[in-house]
Amino acid sequence: KSSNEATNITPKHNMKAFLDELKAENIKKFLYNFTQIPHLAGTEQNFQLAKQIQSQWKEFGLDSVELAHYDVLLSYPNKTHPNYISIINEDGNEIFNTSLFEPPPPGYENVSDIVPPFSAFSPQGMPEGDLVYVNYARTEDFFKLERDMKINCSGKIVIARYGKVFRGNKVKNAQLAGAKGVILYSDPADYFAPGVKSYPDGWNLPGGGVQRGNILNLNGAGDPLTPGYPANEYAYRRGIAEAVGLPSIPVHPIGYYDAQKLLEKMGGSAPPDSSWRGSLKVPYNVGPGFTGNFSTQKVKMHIHSTNEVTRIYNVIGTLRGAVEPDRYVILGGHRDSWVFGGIDPQSGAAVVHEIVRSFGTLKKEGWRPRRTILFASWDAEEFGLLGSTEWAEENSRLLQERGVAYINADSSIEGNYTLRVDCTPLMYSLVHNLTKELKSPDEGFEGKSLYESWTKKSPSPEFSGMPRISKLGSGNDFEVFFQRLGIASGRARYTKNWETNKFSGYPLYHSVYETYELVEKFYDPMFKYHLTVAQVRGGMVFELANSIVLPFDCRDYAVVLRKYADKIYSISMKHPQEMKTYSVSFDSLFSAVKNFTEIASKFSERLQDFDKSNPIVLRMMNDQLMFLERAFIDPLGLPDRPFYRHVIYAPSSHNKYAGESFPGIYDALFDIESKVDPSKAWGEVKRQIYVAAFTVQAAAETLSEVA
């Protein structure tokens, strides 16, 4: 049960009062309000929404609500010189051109300032050449092309389907392969679920629909011109040539109608196997170039987008804690959208708005949380998590000393099947206990707990009777808090059935068709899933801010550390001869994990027994819990990724969205058989084992008795 006896003025102000105040109808109303016009980062419309949210949060009763502005690098299409792709014949004539915009959805025909589909931060350029189809443009896809199929992408324009990995990784892989341009497209195999109509008659992607998105490889840097520091009024900005993470080749996204026209002419090699075939009626030949009669035709890209330093605005709301005002629990989600943001981000922003309203209502009745709660409406998330990262850079000294937890609040739904949670192991027990207290919104689970429906629909692969909780990766605003600063973090949303729906994300992701009507008609007409997500996110914040003892269980970290050590050891053991030759041992890591497990167990025992009425001892124990996540931070960061500093978790080097465990060791082992200097490569593996073992041991010692 919730332990929220800290600062109640009257007994009724507990978790139940907070949860009961959350209303589906309000979330629906807020979503409608936030989605009537586009709110692209850096635009007047998004500034006006920031001021509206500031005003409403004040009305709701927060102690203070401020705008925090930064001047960051953003990217926009040229309004008078549109981006497109053409097929040109041997005379240079354009015989086919891709669409310049998505056909607007019904009711939105007269909305202005809909940004046409583009790949944010693409450089300008007009490359022309032969096409190579590279599947999802993953690392393994390029390995297959180059190593197995002997296809050289150098000087070619590659066409890749969206899905599986972050688009920025696709572009990076194409650049490394020597491509001179990238075309990204949405294949129906990934963005059109069988048996569902396309928008506006269903939630599938129409042929003219296109996914926007940034193609940066920031590795946690924030604003490309001010890595490590806030983009404030007196910032020193790098020149564009030294900017972090910008792509070097033109990139442009298209829909599947246009992709059909390019792919149907492809010649060269057949695809290597069925995993390279999508659902279009084309052979999915890899190329290079067009077949037979079309072999003299080329593809030409016309990209004229510009990068501009632009002002962005975060909204930061504060609800001061009554007992520990210098301990911060943060709930944050972004406000900027590519177009209407029906799901991303406004389904999340509407939930945050209702959570703020509920907390405000309790505060107006005399209640305060034990710890300070900070609420954030981040700007420019779509352009590389810029608003959250700049704010965290500006406030890093406060955050690293005072940050208890960060709960992320982007899209509340990506489906309506079951709950999905990614979080630090410290929060596993919090999430389990909370979901046992909440009602499931799922059909067939009336009167049952959320925990029960979630566990049934998404069981843990390791522990029977428990739900799956995933590792944190990146691609959202928790990144700087977790991966850079080591603040315990978590996220929750409602998701699809991954077993039956193999498409990537949700079909209308980042398209003009992501509207209020999409949510209200097809995903959550009763807004019951939104309400459940509000209860999970809000409930986590409530417990983190109000429980006397922080609801973190360090024993769960011990369990996963052992699992991750076993996993990385088994990867290394694929090379038994080299491990022997270069004397590679994981003994130090397993020993550190064993020590961590024993110390965590003893700490947990002390946590049950200590005198909670002694404020000094209480604060001391809570600080050990708060700083445990911080103890996994290596100040030097990961190799070539200085802003990814968490030794246990980092975004995968091959997919920003995915989390990797023991990333330093993992990356050192990756493709090690192809390294030109095996001695050096295995030396780096040994160094990374050393760093990991030391870090786990050091973290364990933070849980030891202080004297």
Partner: antibody, heavy 116, light 107 residues
Framework: EFQLVQSGAEVKKPGASVKVSCKAS????????MNWVRQAPGQRLEWMGL????????DYNQKFKGRVTITRDTSASTAYMELSSLRSEDTAVYYC?????????WGQGTLVTVSS | DIQMTQSPSSLSASVGDRVTITCKAS??????VAWYQQKPGKVPKLLIY???TRHTGVPSRFSGSGSGTDFTLTISSLQPEDVATYYC?????????FGQGTKLEIK
Amino acid sequence: EFQLVQSGAEVKKPGASVKVSCKASGYSFTDHNMNWVRQAPGQRLEWMGLINPNYGTADYNQKFKGRVTITRDTSASTAYMELSSLRSEDTAVYYCARGSSLFAYWGQGTLVTVSS
Amino acid sequence: DIQMTQSPSSLSASVGDRVTITCKASQGVDTAVAWYQQKPGKVPKLLIYWASTRHTGVPSRFSGSGSGTDFTLTISSLQPEDVATYYCQQYSRYPLTFGQGTKLEIK
């Protein structure tokens, strides 16, 4: 070094099935497709199908009309080809070959004799 | 299926001769053609891919050319160790198909 080691020769009666194995070593088994190619005495090479060991998905030459099944065991780094309803014309050397479209690495071959 | 037809089916040439083997595809395959060498009792060995690119370690006397439907394997100066059967293979469409082979002997 890369090696593909196949199981030994088999003699089968018509109508029976045969399962040939191919154990890979010296590289990451899941990174490369495995193909099966056969060669009847004095005949051309004939591609039977392939498996993507990473996903376990197989693609087949329709000529074999459901008679061939290609599987894999990633823990053993081994691919298998099973051919059912054997006939005398299935007498051939069966090769596993690593690659996608191109076959740079081959197993030593397994002679399957179908005789009553 | 795409048929690959080689000619000649067999040929005899002297050491040092220039030898040419042709392969015709029943429909256009761009340059998605490979050539293999198979010595008696041995496994096939990849020689050429993308119609004209020599595989690693293949002697420079072997070369390939062609696109569309007509392809050629040339041995510029025949050596005794080149005695083998040579196969072309298309990889433009499934199923992948091979030619019937050209048996090369030394006179």
